[in-house]
């Protein structure tokens, strides 16, 4: 399912998983949006368990999740930290 | 530079408790994503992993040592440790610390220190 | 836990020879597999990561690849410096488990 490396393009995750990352296991979001060598959207997600993972970020349960973080984010102290990563 | 070094006593009998010190530089254990993790390979033959212990003091062990092993950190030294109580033979091997980087790609044990022989006898 | 077999364990090939070492994984580790070179006397330095995926400053010869769950390196020409243990890791799931190592000697 997942594979990530170094590519040409400079693109952190050459496959991505769509199944679902549950919200109490996700410990950190990265979204880093095209640029510096890199044609696509990358979503990165940290677990708890100590994993890294590369998600595809037309997922529709991570639009939802990424919702939901972001409203929280406003109200209280957000669950799982969302970086939107800059494209240098 | 990422360098990582290992300390330890080199002999001790079975029994005793093994006290094993990884200092390194180049990164620091206070990082969001950082590890360190230690294996150990008997002379002539493959690696074992022991345990990983992580920035935010997560750790994790090897189950076939988990009740005589322990992994702890030292942030404002740049140490981690490793010890493994009531030695035997069995334990006689060079004992290696390893970085290990929450990173996209992920590669676990991507800087090793030198290692450090570590003999169990009467 | 996870059991990584590695196959041969010693292996003795002339320069210029095309190489493979395998190791097949107990359960599914998803491409979550590193090769390691070590040397005599040195510590292990990661060759392949992800199963398929040169880490910087290996050279092209190596290279790796993966059937069902049968992981392998492949070294296309055999040269006299890749004389070395080689070990795969599964990072999959705790505990981490490696192969038992194959050492590559030279005819």
């Known amino acids: 399912i997942l594979e990530a490396h170094y590519t040409n393009l400079k693109c952190r995750c050459s496959g991505v998983i769509s199944t679902v990352v549950g919200l109490n296991i996700i410990d950190r979001i990265q979204v880093t949006p095209p640029g510096n060598g890199c044609p696509k959207t990358e979503v990165v997600i940290w677990t708890k368990m100590k994993k890294v993972i590369c998600v595809n970020p037309r997922a529709k349960w991570l639009q939802r999740l990424l919702r939901h973080v972001q409203s929280k984010s406003l109200s209280s102290t957000p669950q799982a930290p969302v970086s939107k990563r800059r494209a240098a | 530079q990422v360098t990582l070094k290992e300390s330890g006593p080199g002999i001790l009998q079975p029994s005793q408790t093994l006290s094993l010190t990884c200092t390194f530089s180049?990164?620091?254990?206070?990082?969001?994503?950082?590890?360190v993790g230690w294996i150990r390979q008997p002379s002539g033959k493959g690696l074992e992993w022991l345990a990983n212990?992580?920035?935010?003091?997560?750790?994790y062990s090897n189950p076939s040592l988990q009740s005589r092993l322990t992994i702890s950190k030292d942030t404002s030294n740049n140490q981690a440790f490793l010890t493994i109580t009531n030695v035997d033979t069995a334990d006689t091997a060079t004992y290696y610390c390893?970085?290990?980087?929450?990173?996209?790609?992920?590669?676990?044990?991507?800087?090793w220190g030198q290692g450090v022989r570590v003999t169990v006898s009467s | 836990d996870i059991q990584m077999t590695q196959s041969p364990s010693s292996m003795s090939a002339s320069l210029g020879d095309r190489v493979t070492i395998t190791c097949q994984a107990s359960?599914?580790?998803?491409?979550?597999l590193i090769w390691f070179q070590q040397k005599p006397g040195r510590s292990p330095r990661p060759m392949i990561y992800?199963?398929?995926n040169l880490a910087n400053g290996v050279p092209s010869r190596f290279s790796g690849s993966r059937s069902g769950s049968d992981y392998s390196l492949t070294i296309s020409s055999l040269e006299s410096e890749d004389m070395a243990d080689y070990h795969c890791?599964?990072?999959?799931?705790?505990?981490?488990?490696f192969g038992s190592g194959t050492k590559l000697e030279i005819k």
């Open positions: 890791l599964q990072f999959k799931q705790y505990p981490f488990t």
């Open positions: 992800y199963a398929t």
């Open positions: 180049g990164f620091s254990l206070t990082t969001y994503g950082m590890g």
């Open positions: 390893a970085r290990s980087e929450l990173v996209m790609p992920y590669v676990p044990f991507d800087y």
């Open positions: 212990i992580w920035w935010d003091d997560d750790k």
């Open positions: 359960q599914d580790i998803d491409n979550h």
